[in-house]
């Protein structure tokens, strides 16, 4: 972008405000809520997006926990602390000094405590399972066509390297997309699976984060794929630490 483009915008993040006073007079886009300058050639980190969303809060999300090690976002929206790279800080606290530890996608992975709670490191979510149910169609989708279309979507729309889409499972009407990305596999410039999953989740809910693009129009061999519910399960490289009270509740 250059200053000559009077209305500079951020194609990959509509939760920004852009102005032509960046380096070299180029367009510079700042995330709402944090004021951090974002790279509009790639996805914005989920932490900065969540912070921006909290500057205009919407209804919180609630998901379900499927087993003892997979996490889901049961706590809904909160105003997170992000580190200098835009990632979630390992320890998050609210206004009343209640603190908890989160994983790399910002989901709580410990019981809540006070300001003395220590979160030694940001634990990486290395496996994400996106569980979708599609609306009834005349017949089942062809599995290989569906697989190819979803892989194309993650590659082209979310810029996620194909090697991180581990598998696409299908048993009508349930589709499961597995994303895997270990710390050692993620190179500089690679989109994080957590960010890709968050953009996808917002897309299927009709709340696209992309600027000016139409909503997600998923088609398999011309047949619309309409998602009626989404659950996202998160698996961390180190299992979460919840008390027995919570696990047996």
């Amino acid at each position: 972008h250059t200053a000559a483009q009077d209305n500079c915008t951020c194609p990959t993040n509509k939760m920004t405000v852009c102005s032509p006073d960046g380096p070299g007079g180029r367009c510079q886009c700042r995330a709402l809520g944090s004021g951090v300058a974002v790279d509009c050639s790639t996805l914005t980190s989920e932490c900065l997006l969540l912070k921006a969303r909290m500057s205009a809060p919407k209804n919180a999300r609630t998901l379900v926990r499927p087993n003892e090690h997979a996490l889901v976002d049961n706590d809904g929206l909160y105003d997170p602390d992000c580190d200098p790279e835009g990632r979630f800080k390992a320890r998050q606290c609210n206004q009343t000094s209640v603190c908890w530890c989160v994983n790399s996608v910002g989901v709580r992975r410990t019981d809540k405590g006070d300001l003395s709670l220590r979160c030694d490191e940001l634990v990486r979510t290395h496996h994400i399972l996106i569980d979708l149910r599609h609306r009834p169609t005349a017949g089942a989708f062809n599995h290989s066509d569906l697989d190819a279309e979803l892989r194309r979507l993650f590659r082209e729309r979310y810029r996620l390297h194909p090697k991180f889409v581990a598998a696409v499972h299908y048993e009508q009407p349930t589709i499961q997309i597995e994303l895997r990305q270990n710390t050692s596999q993620k190179a500089a410039g690679d989109v994080d699976i957590g960010d890709a999953a968050y953009y996808f989740e917002r897309d299927v809910k009709g709340e696209s984060l992309f600027q000016g693009r139409g909503g997600l129009d998923l088609r398999v061999r011309g047949e619309p794929l309409q998602v009626e519910r989404t659950l996202i399960y998160y698996l961390d490289e180190i299992p979460p630490k919840f008390s027995m009270k919570r696990l047996t509740a």
Epitope: S19, P20, D21, G22, P23, S34, G35, A37, P84
Partner: antibody, heavy 116, light 111 residues
């Protein structure tokens, strides 16, 4: 050429409010952030917050949140900074500046004196 | 909040000599592409004047004896050959995240 012209000096009593204006000209007002900076007598610069007139988006320094209110009138190409519940330590020169940080054009400053 | 620490607090340099002012940030304010650090000059009774934007970009109309360098947490403003009109207070400011804090200032005088 780009210009930011601020309103004149003000003398206020503790507990009162003051509203400083900053009239912009020479550029598209809605395309750039306007920041506000405080400078107490003999002291350094302190960032108060900024506003994007194109959408009314605002950011505040936590220290000034709740007492400072930034607004903009796009039809008049004017930004405003209102400071409420004034106390003696609010005595300062207040500047507006165009830009997000690295403000390239500044107003001449408005001296606000808080005295009983 | 990011804290910017300037050093020295004051500096006396002979005319024609080099003046160097440092600014250290409490955390990195750089990406692989840009550093979000800026430098201002302020003379008594005047508003600050932008000298250097994004660590090293000289603002238009600013004499080329002024230069900026650095990345990450350590930044430097250099005046290669001090002139009488350079007597002022110099401030660094970051625009990495809110709030966009300033350094405490460095007063530059002629020796």
């Amino acid at each position: 050429q780009v210009q930011l012209v601020q309103s004149g000096a003000e003398v206020k009593k503790p507990g009162a409010s003051v509203k400083v204006s900053c009239k912009a000209s020479g550029y598209t007002f809605t395309n750039y952030w306007i920041g506000w900076v405080k400078q107490a007598p003999g002291q350094g610069l302190e960032w108060i917050g900024d506003i994007y007139p194109g959408g009314g988006y605002t950011n505040y320094n936590e220290k000034f949140k709740g007492r400072a209110t930034l607004t903009a009138d796009t039809s008049a190409s004017t930004a405003y900074m209102e400071l409420s519940s004034l106390r003696s330590e609010d005595t300062a020169v207040y500047y507006c500046a165009r830009g997000t940080g690295g403000g390239d054009y500044w107003g001449q400053g408005t001296l606000v004196t808080v005295s009983s | 909040d990011i804290v910017l620490t300037q050093s020295p607090d004051s500096l006396a340099v002979s005319l024609g000599e080099r003046a160097t002012i440092n600014c250290r940030a409490s955390q990195s304010v750089s990406t692989s592409s840009y550093s979000y650090m800026h430098w201002y000059q302020q003379k008594p009774g005047q508003p600050p004047k932008l000298l250097i934007k994004y660590a090293s970009n000289l603002e238009s109309g600013v004499p080329d004896r002024f230069s900026g360098s650095g990345s990450g947490t350590d930044f430097t403003l250099t005046i290669s050959s001090l002139q009488a009109e350079d007597v002022a207070v110099y401030y660094c400011q970051h625009s990495w995240e809110i709030p966009y804090t300033f350094g405490g200032g460095t007063k530059l005088e002629i020796k």
